[in-house]
C-alpha cells in the first residue's frame, strides 16, 4: 500500500532508503531539455515475489524539442538555478541489497536522468537520514523514519535528526578534535554525539546518493 | 495529509474564458506534476494535460491544445488552468490531479450559459 | 490514442458477491493500468496502480489483475459502499486515456 505523503524533510539533511519494498514506485525523470519518450513509461515499479524482485519498465529521455505538444516554461525565479546533487559527508559505500526478501536494489541511472528522484514509497518502507556536507549530525534517536498504516491512514515517523551548520566540526564521527575531557562539552552537545555505529548505519544506505530524491510526472 | 483545493463552481458566458485553480497542500509542490483532468456527463474522463511545476515543462492532450493552459505559482503552490473561448462542450466538472492520480481534487463545475 | 474499453456499462450484484469488471486496451500497455472508484457526487478515488498494487487504505476486497490488453478489477464480498462507478485508466503511452466507466448497482 502506497504512503500517502512523503517522508518528513529535515533542514539540511537527505534521507535514502538501504533498499525498496514491492510496489515502490520511482518517476521516470528527465533533466532539463529533456522528457519522457512518448510511449515511455510513467515510473519503474520494484516488482516480484519474496524470492526475487526487480524493477518493472524503463526510464527513457529523449530531447524535448522533438514532441510539439510538450513547452517549457520560464520556471519561477527560485527555480531557474540548476538542481544541484545533494552530498553526503563521506562517499557512500554499495550495500548487498539481495539479501532482503521482496526489495529491489538502487536502480541504475538512465540516459539524461534528472538530478533529483522521486519515490513513492509503500507502507513499511524505512528511509535514513544523513546530514549533507558542511552539517554535523546530532542525534537524539534513530537518524531514521518509517512509514506506518494507523486507522487506515499512512504517517511516516519522525526522525530524531538535527543538522548543525558548525563547518569546523564537521569531521566524521570518530575523528573529532580532541577533548580535554567529556566534561568539557556543553551539555546539549553532549547528550546527542553521534556514535559510530550511528554513522556506520548510514554510510551502509546505497551507492549512488543523489539529491533530495524526489520528482514525478504524470503525462 | 496531501489536499488539492479547488473552487465549486463558475458560472461563464460563452466565448469568454475562465482561469480556475487548483491549491495544493502536504506534498512539495514543485516536485510533483498537477494534472488536469475533465469529466462530462456520457464522456467518461479525459486528459488534458499536466504542468511539473519545478521543471517547467508542460504536456497537453493535442485534443485540448488551444483550449486549455497550464501555468503554475510555486510562491503559493497553486496550479491554474484557463479554458478560452468558451462553447456549451466546455460545461463540465474540470479534477486537478497529483502524484500520479492518486490524488485528486474535488473538482471544478464549469457552466458555459448565456 | 490508446482505447480503453468497458464493454459493460452497468453491473448489478448483492452484498457479499463477487465481482469483476473488466477492460480492455487497444494495444499491449503492459502493466500501466490504475482502477478508479467514483461515487455519486464525488470526484474520482484511486483504488489500483500497476494494475494489481493497492493505494493505501483501499480494502483488501478490491484486487486488481491483468497485463498486456486485458485488465480485471474484482471486488470479492461485494458491501453496500461499493456502489459506484469504476474507471480504468492507462498510462503506458501519451495522451493517457480512461474507459468510459462501468456503473456498479447493488441489488
Known amino acids: 500500500e502506497l504512503c500517502d505523503d512523503d517522508p518528513p524533510e529535515i533542514p539540511h539533511a537527505t534521507f535514502k532508503a538501504m533498499a525498496y519494498k514491492e510496489g515502490t514506485m520511482l518517476n521516470c525523470e528527465c533533466k532539463r531539455g529533456f522528457r519522457r519518450i512518448k510511449s515511455g513509461s510513467l515510473y519503474m515499479l520494484c516488482t516480484g515475489n519474496s524470492s526475487h524482485s526487480s524493477w518493472d519498465n524503463q526510464c527513457q529521455c529523449t530531447s524535448s524539442a522533438t514532441r510539439n505538444t510538450t513547452k517549457q516554461v520560464t520556471p519561477q525565479p527560485e527555480e531557474q538555478k540548476e538542481r544541484k546533487t545533494t552530498e553526503m559527508q563521506s562517499p557512500m559505500q554499495p550495500v548487498d541489497q539481495a539479501s532482503l526478501p521482496g526489495h529491489c536494489r538502487e536502480p541504475p541511472p538512465w540516459e539524461n536522468e534528472a538530478t533529483e528522484r522521486i519515490y513513492h514509497f509503500v507502507v513499511g518502507q524505512m528511509v535514513y537520514y544523513q546530514c549533507v556536507q558542511g552539517y554535523r549530525a546530532l542525534h537524539r534517536g534513530p537518524a531514521e523514519s518509517v512509514c506506518k498504516m494507523t486507522h487506515g491512514k499512512t504517517r511516516w515517523t519522525q526522525p530524531q535528526l538535527i543538522c548543525t551548520g558548525e563547518m569546523e566540526t564537521s569531521q566524521f564521527p570518530g575523528e573529532e578534535k580532541p577533548q580535554a575531557s567529556p566534561e568539557g562539552r556543553p551539555e546539549s552537545e553532549t547528550s546527542c554525539l553521534v556514535t559510530t555505529t550511528d554513522f556506520q548505519i548510514q554510510t551502509e544506505m546505497a551507492a549512488t546518493m543523489e539529491t533530495s530524491i524526489f520528482t514525478t510526472e504524470y503525462q | 495529509q496531501v489536499q488539492l483545493q479547488q473552487p465549486g463552481a463558475e458560472l461563464v458566458r460563452p466565448g469568454t474564458s475562465v482561469k480556475m485553480s487548483c491549491k495544493a497542500a502536504?506534498?512539495?509542490?514543485?516536485?510533483?506534476?498537477i494534472g488536469w483532468v475533465k469529466q462530462r456527463p456520457g464522456h467518461g474522463l479525459e486528459w488534458i494535460g499536466d504542468?511539473?511545476?519545478?521543471?517547467?515543462?508542460?504536456n497537453y492532450n493535442e485534443k485540448f491544445t488551444g483550449k486549455a493552459t497550464l501555468t503554475a505559482d510555486t510562491s503559493s503552490s497553486t496550479a491554474y488552468m484557463q479554458l478560452s473561448s468558451l462553447t456549451s462542450e466546455d460545461s463540465a466538472i474540470y479534477y486537478c490531479v497529483s502524484r500520479n492520480f492518486a490524488n485528486w481534487g474535488q473538482g471544478t463545475l464549469v457552466t458555459v450559459s448565456a | 490514442d490508446i482505447q480503453m474499453t468497458q464493454s459493460q456499462k452497468f453491473m448489478s450484484t448483492s452484498v457479499g458477491d463477487r465481482v469483476s469488471v473488466t477492460c480492455k486496451a487497444s494495444q499491449n500497455v503492459g502493466t500501466n493500468v490504475a482502477w478508479y472508484q467514483q461515487k455519486p457526487g464525488q470526484s474520482p478515488k484511486a483504488l489500483i496502480y500497476s494494475a494489481s498494487y493497492r493505494y493505501s487504505g483501499v480494502p483488501d476486497r478490491f484486487t486488481g489483475s491483468g497485463s498486456g490488453t486485458d485488465f480485471t478489477l474484482t471486488i470479492s464480498n461485494v458491501q453496500s459502499e461499493d456502489l459506484a462507478e469504476y474507471f480504468c485508466q492507462q498510462y503506458n503511452s501519451y495522451p493517457w486515456t480512461f474507459g468510459g466507466g462501468t456503473k456498479l448497482e447493488i441489488k
Open positions: 502536504g506534498y512539495t509542490f514543485s516536485n510533483y506534476w
Open positions: 504542468i511539473h511545476p519545478g521543471g517547467g515543462y508542460i
